[in-house]
């Protein structure tokens, strides 16, 4: 058993059929010695008397808010949550496996630049009685500070029969050095509590691996005289790291016909302009990627050819 926060405790339960459970001793936080009784949640049934209460925690029915009283007065509370292990594996019931980029991916994180700011998000089908707490650091043995905000509900979607909820959190490395080579990964830890169930999820990454630039901005077309060609120009996104001479991007320019079946013409360039043939009813799209490290491409920025 360990303390999650004041008066909230997590019991680690290795569960299997007929498991004996965990013996837990609760102590009433009071100088009183006599006349103390214990109850669970809203029930008035007395579970025991004395300054300590010993319980056998076998299942969620044994978890909840234990209260010690004296003469009708509440002395203290202890909320017991369960962290369940089955077949040697901690439960991961609260969050949905996003399966990207691999199975058992519960947390996904992205950074728009090298400033040390990043966003993580996760999915759940649970709509109520749900709280998240996020902590982060660089490295784990001698951790350097990363400050995370509160997790917030960022999207709701309908997926077949179920509603899906996306939560996200923003974090900032306290002493980020954008130009430095990373040697220790960022660690992100999410505590999830649903009703009386506790679970924790972790992710470990280098900022360079989670970079995804914003799409190029100010995408414009300039027709070339007496030609089907156009000059496409764009700019680095505002959110990208500066100076651009050091934090450089490479770009992919795509001409896509109205039909998805039509052949796509693609051009790769390190410049912020390119000359392409603009077909009728086609659109031109540009996306960006770090020039020197193959992290994710940005989403496309698009303009119609007409």
């Amino acid at each position: 058993i360990w303390e999650l926060k004041k008066d909230v405790y997590v019991v680690e339960l290795d569960w299997y059929p007929d498991a004996p459970g965990e013996m837990v001793v609760l102590t009433c936080d009071t100088p009183e010695e006599d006349g103390i009784t214990w109850t669970l949640d809203q029930s008035s049934e007395v579970l025991g008397s004395g300054k300590t209460l010993t319980i056998q925690v076998k299942e969620f029915g044994d978890a909840g808010q234990y209260t010690c009283h004296k003469g009708g007065e509440v002395l203290s509370h202890s909320l017991l949550l369960l962290h369940k292990k089955e077949d040697g594996i901690w439960s991961t019931d609260i969050l949905k496996d996003q399966k990207e980029p691999k199975n058992k991916t519960f947390l996904r994180c992205e950074a728009k630049n090298y400033s040390g700011r990043f966003t993580c998000w996760w999915l759940t089908t649970i709509s109520t009685d749900l709280t998240f707490s996020v902590k982060s650091s660089r490295g784990s043995s001698d951790p350097q500070g990363v400050t995370c905000g509160a997790a917030t509900l960022s999207a709701e979607r309908v997926r077949g029969d179920n509603k899906e909820y996306e939560y996200s959190v923003e974090c900032q490395e306290d002493s980020a050095c954008p130009a430095a080579e990373e040697s220790l990964p960022i660690e992100v830890m999410v505590d999830a509590v649903h009703k009386l169930k506790y679970e924790n999820y972790t992710s470990s990454f280098f900022i360079r691996d989670i970079i995804k630039p914003d799409p190029p901005k100010n995408l414009q077309l300039k027709p070339l005289k007496n030609s089907r060609q156009v000059e496409v120009s764009w700019e680095y996104p505002d959110t990208w790291s500066t100076p651009h001479s050091y934090f450089s991007l490479t770009f992919c320019v795509q001409v896509q016909g109205k039909s998805k079946r039509e052949k796509k013409d693609r051009v790769f360039t390190d410049k912020t302009s390119a000359t392409v043939i603009c077909r009728k009813n086609a659109s031109i799209s540009v996306r960006a990627q770090d020039r020197y490290y193959s992290s994710s491409w940005s989403e496309w920025a698009s303009v119609p050819c007409s």
Partner: nanobody, 123 residues
Framework: EVQLVESGGGVVQAGESLRLSCAAS????????MGWFRQAPGTEREFVAT????????YYADSVKGRFTISRDNAKNTVYLQMSSLKPEDTAVYYC????????????????WGQGTQVTVSS
Amino acid sequence: EVQLVESGGGVVQAGESLRLSCAASGRSLNNEEMGWFRQAPGTEREFVATISRRGTGTYYADSVKGRFTISRDNAKNTVYLQMSSLKPEDTAVYYCAAGQLFPSSRSRDYDYWGQGTQVTVSS
């Protein structure tokens, strides 16, 4: 919202068997832990059995252990309770319930409930 409908109840002789079914609609049961409870006249609702969302874990009340088997078919969105060696004291209305906490024998840990199906065991 999950709607649960129990079926399969009836009148049987002591020692006989019965299979209850609980069909869900409105939402997939894939993310729900499922349980069976029962209530005899003049008594509180009593836990019978529960099964984890993937069907890999089961948990029974001592009074039914070895006689009752809970199972589920997520493709059919249905949970079953196979009851054998029935006794007169098994007579009750049997309720199907869905929740998020496995294992739990406490009724308030379940979020959705069916209307119940009557099982009567005569001696």
